[in-house]
């Protein structure tokens, strides 16, 4: 799977959307690695 910064950002946005934004405060693109997915 794609692990570039842009892919990570878009995947995280999708995750946030599906979760209704209910995630940890530090769950942001620059804090999560590809292993988060």
């Amino acid at each position: 799977s794609c692990n570039t910064a842009t892919c990570v950002t878009h995947r995280l946005a999708g995750l946030l959307s599906r979760s209704g934004g209910v995630v940890k405060d530090n769950f942001v693109p620059t804090n999560v690695g590809s292993e988060a997915f």
């Epitope: 794609c2 950002t9 878009h10 946030l16 693109p29 620059t30």
Partner: antibody, heavy 119, light 107 residues
């Protein structure tokens, strides 16, 4: 309102260096990667690299590795792109850009900084 | 580096026309493609990400499709403000690379 405001136009001589700044506002600067892209006159867009403002980690286009240096000043919410050993082919508009999720999911770009390299 | 080949390089169209721009990647990039619109003297404006998703505020007449190596941007009914140059970008692999652009001109 998310804004990326870049420094003004620069004129440099061949062999010199230039440092372009990009001040971010309206979002948490350290949460999102910052990209740098350039566009020479009449040419396609060209990706220079990206930086993680939280850690300072960088990815560079090999074409610019060794000549381009990306840095950030977290306290000033500002990203910098320095390009050394300038040549005429480096004459271009340089952009910073960042994909933000909060407050608005969008790919924001700075207004561009024109760098002219001429003897 | 992955090459992104756009076609056509330019086209002439009229208001109301359906316009299709294609982008071919030199290797598989899954759906990790974005499309941008750029007007003279302006910064690029993001339209599409992940091949087919519109950013908020982008008119519904813009749509993207494709996966793997072949991608398409379609403008269903061209408006006066759509005359511009359009670029595709792959972000599946470093370095990110852009297509050569398609200039949409008034017929």
């Amino acid at each position: 309102e998310v804004q990326l405001v870049q420094s003004g136009a620069e004129v440099k001589k061949p062999g010199a260096s230039v440092k372009v700044s990009c001040k971010a506002s309206g979002y948490t600067f350290t949460d999102y990667y910052m990209n740098w892209v350039r566009q020479a006159p009449g040419q396609r867009l060209e990706w220079i690299g990206d930086i993680n403002p939280n850690t300072g980690g960088t990815n560079y286009n090999q074409k610019f590795k060794g000549r381009a240096t990306l840095t950030v000043d977290k306290s000033a919410s500002t990203a910098y792109m320095e390009l050394s050993s300038l040549r005429s082919e480096d004459t271009a508009v340089y952009y910073c850009a960042s994909i933000i999720i909060v407050p608005n999911y969008f790919d924001y770009w700075g207004q561009g900084t024109t760098v002219t390299v001429s003897s | 580096d992955i090459q992104m080949t756009q076609s056509p390089s330019s086209l002439s169209a009229s208001v109301g026309d359906r316009v299709t721009i294609t982008c071919k990647a030199s290797q598989n990039v899954d759906t990790n493609v974005a499309w941008f619109q750029q007007k003279p003297g302006k910064s690029p404006k993001a339209l599409i990400y992940s091949a087919s998703y519109r950013y908020s505020g982008v008119p519904s007449r813009f749509s993207g499709s494709g996966s793997g190596t072949d991608f398409t941007l379609t403008i269903s009914s061209l408006q006066p403000e759509d005359f511009a140059t359009y670029y595709c970008q792959q972000y599946n692999n470093y370095p990110y690379t852009f297509g050569g652009g398609t200039k949409v001109e008034i017929k």
